[in-house]
């Protein structure tokens, strides 16, 4: 398994499960060392860090991008590196942390979440099985691009959103990544928290569609931070 090299995805300071946002509680799961998972209200963290080898950004966690660890280093030796925060230099969107994108070589804030090639989000749905076992963070499926003669329909296995038909994005669904519908106005979405707050991506939602952004539902402004419901709303 990948447990020995998964520590680059150890996540610290995770807020309470966001399952309530989708109407489901966070489920208990057991985890191998090096990974943090919700288990009721308890969390495990591992502080040591081991780099995860990669070939492209999609193989890294949501708070990471794939690059050579040294400037001008051997491009053949790449690892997952921590994403760059706002106002830091960048060369592509994937280098910037969730909620930001690369504009004119600088990571800038984006209220819309269209800019990263994939979806970043926390656990917003229950695993639905308190006896699930996670032996490690589920890495991205490595599929040959030759598979994609036609764009994937909803439910088709994918590697990235460009593999999916119009109106769909590529998002994790437990042990696979599949094409799912881009969210419409009024649908529940996941607002990305600060860096370090991303949970294990097991059941992802797509981003909000064009002209929409993920915002707190008006009648939920009074609710506590952990239970605020976000929906796709017009700008």
């Amino acid at each position: 398994t990948l447990n020995s090299v998964l520590n680059s995805n150890a996540i610290k300071n995770l807020p309470p499960p966001l399952g309530g946002a989708a109407g489901h509680p966070g489920s208990a799961v057991s985890a191998a060392p090096g990974i943090l998972y919700p288990g009721g209200n308890k969390y495990q963290t591992i502080d040591n860090y081991q780099p995860y080898p990669c070939a492209e950004d999609e193989e890294c966690g949501t708070d990471e991008y794939c690059a050579s660890p040294t400037r001008g280093g051997d491009a053949g030796v790449q690892i997952c590196l921590a994403c760059r925060k706002r106002r830091k230099r960048c060369m592509r969107h994937a280098m910037c942390c969730p909620g930001n994108y690369c504009k004119n070589g600088i990571c800038v804030s984006s209220d819309q979440n269209h800019f990263r090639g994939e979806i970043e989000e926390t656990i917003t749905e229950s695993f639905g099985n308190d006896h699930s076992t996670l032996d490690g963070y589920s890495r991205r499926t490595t599929l040959s691009s030759k598979m994609y003669h036609t764009k994937g329909q909803e439910g088709s296995v994918c590697l990235r959103s460009s593999d999916c038909a119009s109106g769909l994005c590529c998002a994790r669904h437990f042990w696979s990544k599949i094409c799912k519908p881009v969210l419409k106005e009024g649908q529940v979405c996941t607002k990305h928290r600060r860096k370090g707050s991303h949970g294990l991506e097991i059941f992802q939602r797509c981003y909000c569609g064009e002209g929409l952004s993920c915002r707190i539902q008006k009648d939920h402004h009074q609710a506590s931070n952990s239970s605020r419901l976000h929906t796709c709303q017009r700008h």
Partner: antibody
Framework: EVQLLESGGGLVQPGGSLRLSCAAS????????MAWVRQAPGKGLEWVST????????YYADSVKGRFTISRDNSKNTLYLQMNSLRAEDTAVYYC???????????WGQGTLVTVSS | DIQMTQSPSSLSASVGDRVTITCRAS??????LNWYQQKPGKAPKLLIY???SLQTGVPSRFSGSGSGTDFTLTISSLQPEDFATYYC?????????FGGGTKVEIK
């Protein structure tokens, strides 16, 4: 040709162990999630366990949790199911199946019969 | 766990008939429903995934519809090779569960 071939089934006493294997060919095995699904004689289908393509995520049905272990060796294109503390109710044809192109199991083996009886 | 209830458990039909099988989930599964066909002594075969997407190589007489908790598999014109048992299965969240099956027999 895409193919899954199960082996390792047989007669075993209650409390005993068996290890099922599923050899894959004709597709990029390591890229896809795989599962074991069983069918008791004359009964319907029951999902047993799933493992992600890289082998780092596993799920089990409650009925086998703690007794069965799913694993895979991507270098050998083989899926395994280690079955311990077998019970009479585990008697079934065990199929291995894969999510090759979508969320349904679109590739299946021919099945291997496991009989638990004294 | 999400329970899947199929109906009818069996039906008799003739070649050329339009056949409808229903599947109901105990809670919403959005569109994460698959349909399988199984013939005696054989492994199941995926017909439809994600409620309505036809698996490659499956004849267009098979179609699926529904959303949330209620789903339907329709065979527009039953052919001799369609006499088999059909199962629905949810892939919304583990544990993945199947319906009890619908046996389609020759009238």
């Amino acid at each position: 040709e895409v193919q899954l071939l199960e082996s390792g089934g047989g007669l075993v006493q209650p409390g005993g162990s068996l290890r099922l294997s599923c050899a894959a060919s004709g597709f990029s095995f390591s890229s896809f999630a795989m599962a074991w699904v069983r069918q008791a004689p004359g009964k319907g289908l029951e999902w047993v366990s799933t493992i992600s393509g890289s082998g780092d995520v596993t799920y089990y049905a409650d009925s086998v949790k703690g007794r069965f272990t799913i694993s895979r060796d991507n270098s050998k294109n083989t899926l395994y199911l280690q079955m311990n503390s077998l019970r009479a109710e585990d008697t079934a044809v065990y199929y291995c199946a894969g999510h090759r192109s979508n969320i349904g199991w679109d590739v299946w083996g021919q099945g291997t019969l496991v009989t638990v009886s004294s | 766990d999400i329970q899947m209830t199929q109906s009818p458990s069996s039906l008799s039909a003739s070649v050329g008939d339009r056949v409808t099988i229903t599947c109901r989930a105990s809670q919403t599964i959005r569109t994460y429903l698959n349909w399988y066909q199984q013939k005696p002594g054989k492994a199941p075969k995926l017909l439809i995934y994600a409620t309505s997407s036809l698996q490659t190589g499956v004849p267009s007489r098979f179609s699926g519809s529904g959303s949330g908790t209620d789903f339907t598999l329709t065979i527009s014109s039953l052919q001799p090779e369609d006499f088999a048992t059909y199962y629905c299965q949810q892939s919304y969240r583990p544990p993945l569960t199947f319906g009890g099956g619908t046996k389609v027999e020759i009238k």
